[in-house]
Amino acid sequence: GSERTCCPVNWVEHERSCYWFSRSGKAWADADNYCRLEDAHLVVVTSWEEQKFVQHHIGPVNTWMGLHDQNGPWKWVDGTDYETGFKNWRPEQPDDWYGHGLGGGEDCAHFTDDGRWNDDVCQRPYRWVCETELDKASQEPPLL
């Protein structure tokens, strides 16, 4: 099939990507699976411009992104290089805090109420954002 030229219904197009913003919460792994079932991935933030776009749509609400360090180093779910890529952590974050009493540290990244990032317990039921590149959004042409 041909490349898609528009985003699915209820998704928002921005800079050749399609974004879906949840209005309910899930744990990070469940949100990740949700995006995968949509042929997408948790949002990968690669620029200040993309950060501002996402921040505008989610508002001041804790929201998962596709960044985690569950296997050691911080990794983006789509393979984007973390070390050389865009970052927007809150001061003194990530801190892998153990003081929450839930067991373990903090291995999943989310947007905080001011848009900057924090690491948190992956089981917390936060909202999330899915992203898919426009030319990967479907193998179908747009409906006429």
Epitope: G25, D30, Y34, L37, E38, D39
Partner: antibody, heavy 118, light 107 residues
Framework: EVQLLESGGGLVQPGGSLRLSCAAS????????MSWVRQAPGMGLEWVSA????????FYADSVKGRFTVSRDNSKNTLFLQMNSLRAEDTAVYYC???????????WGQGTLVTVSS | DIQMTQSPSSVSASVGDRVTITCRAS??????LAWFQQKPGRAPKLLIY???SLQSGVPSRFSGSGSGTDFTLTISSLQPEDFATYCC?????????FGHGTKVEVK
């Protein structure tokens, strides 16, 4: 009108294989994830598997993982469930379902009966 | 896996009655809950999704409520066509799981 029509069920011996099909119409098939759900005689519903619209991501219940494979042919608007190493406890009516908004199972086929018995 | 426990397993009621069915999740599923109706020999039919949203074409006498772990399906005034089995489903986490069902039968 959304229509889902399962086929391929029947009687098979333990250890045998069967391939179920689900022909879909009335919606843009490739844009929707799809699921298989089964119901043993007189029992409740059990989710079996799900597959994303382009087929790149699949999910399975532990009870069928490694034995069942879900796939799809978007050019033919058809969903498949390849069932291997079948057991008596796999006996059930198998339904295919369309995953709609937020992945809710909004349309179901009428089901096909799979009986695993010697 | 998340277990979904429905109660009662059956309820006897008359046309016009208000019927309430409950579903309890073994862990927090926020609002990722659906309700289905199934009649003998038929496929399940989606009634309610996201805990309280009414599926298109479903009569307004059906309503859903709850959050977290405790959920309710209410039929405000039972109609003859409502005698069936009702079950809940969570889609918060894989594997998606269903309740065992509540049969609404004629008193």
């Amino acid at each position: 009108e959304v229509q889902l029509l399962e086929s391929g069920g029947g009687l098979v011996q333990p250890g045998g294989s069967l391939r179920l099909s689900c022909a879909a119409s009335g919606f843009t098939f490739s844009r929707n994830a799809m699921s298989w759900v089964r119901q043993a005689p007189g029992m409740g519903l059990e989710w079996v598997s799900a597959i994303s619209g382009r087929g790149g991501n699949t999910f399975y219940a532990d009870s069928v993982k490694g034995r069942f494979t879900v796939s799809r042919d978007n050019s033919k608007n058809t969903l498949f469930l390849q069932m291997n190493s079948l057991r008596a406890e796999d006996t059930a009516v198998y339904y295919c379902a369309k995953n709609g908004r937020e992945q809710w199972l909004d349309y179901w086929g009428q089901g096909t009966l799979v009986t695993v018995s010697s | 896996d998340i277990q979904m426990t429905q109660s009662p397993s059956s309820v006897s009621a008359s046309v016009g009655d208000r019927v309430t069915i409950t579903c309890r999740a073994s862990q927090n599923i926020t609002n990722w809950l659906a309700w289905f109706q199934q009649k003998p020999g038929r496929a399940p039919k989606l009634l309610i999704y996201t805990t309280s949203s009414l599926q298109s074409g479903v009569p307004s006498r059906f309503s859903g409520s709850g959050s977290g772990t405790d959920f309710t399906l209410t039929i405000s005034s039972l109609q003859p066509e409502d005698f069936a089995t009702y079950c809940c489903q969570q889609t918060n986490s894989f594997p998606w799981t269903f309740g065992h069902g509540t049969k609404v039968e004629v008193k």
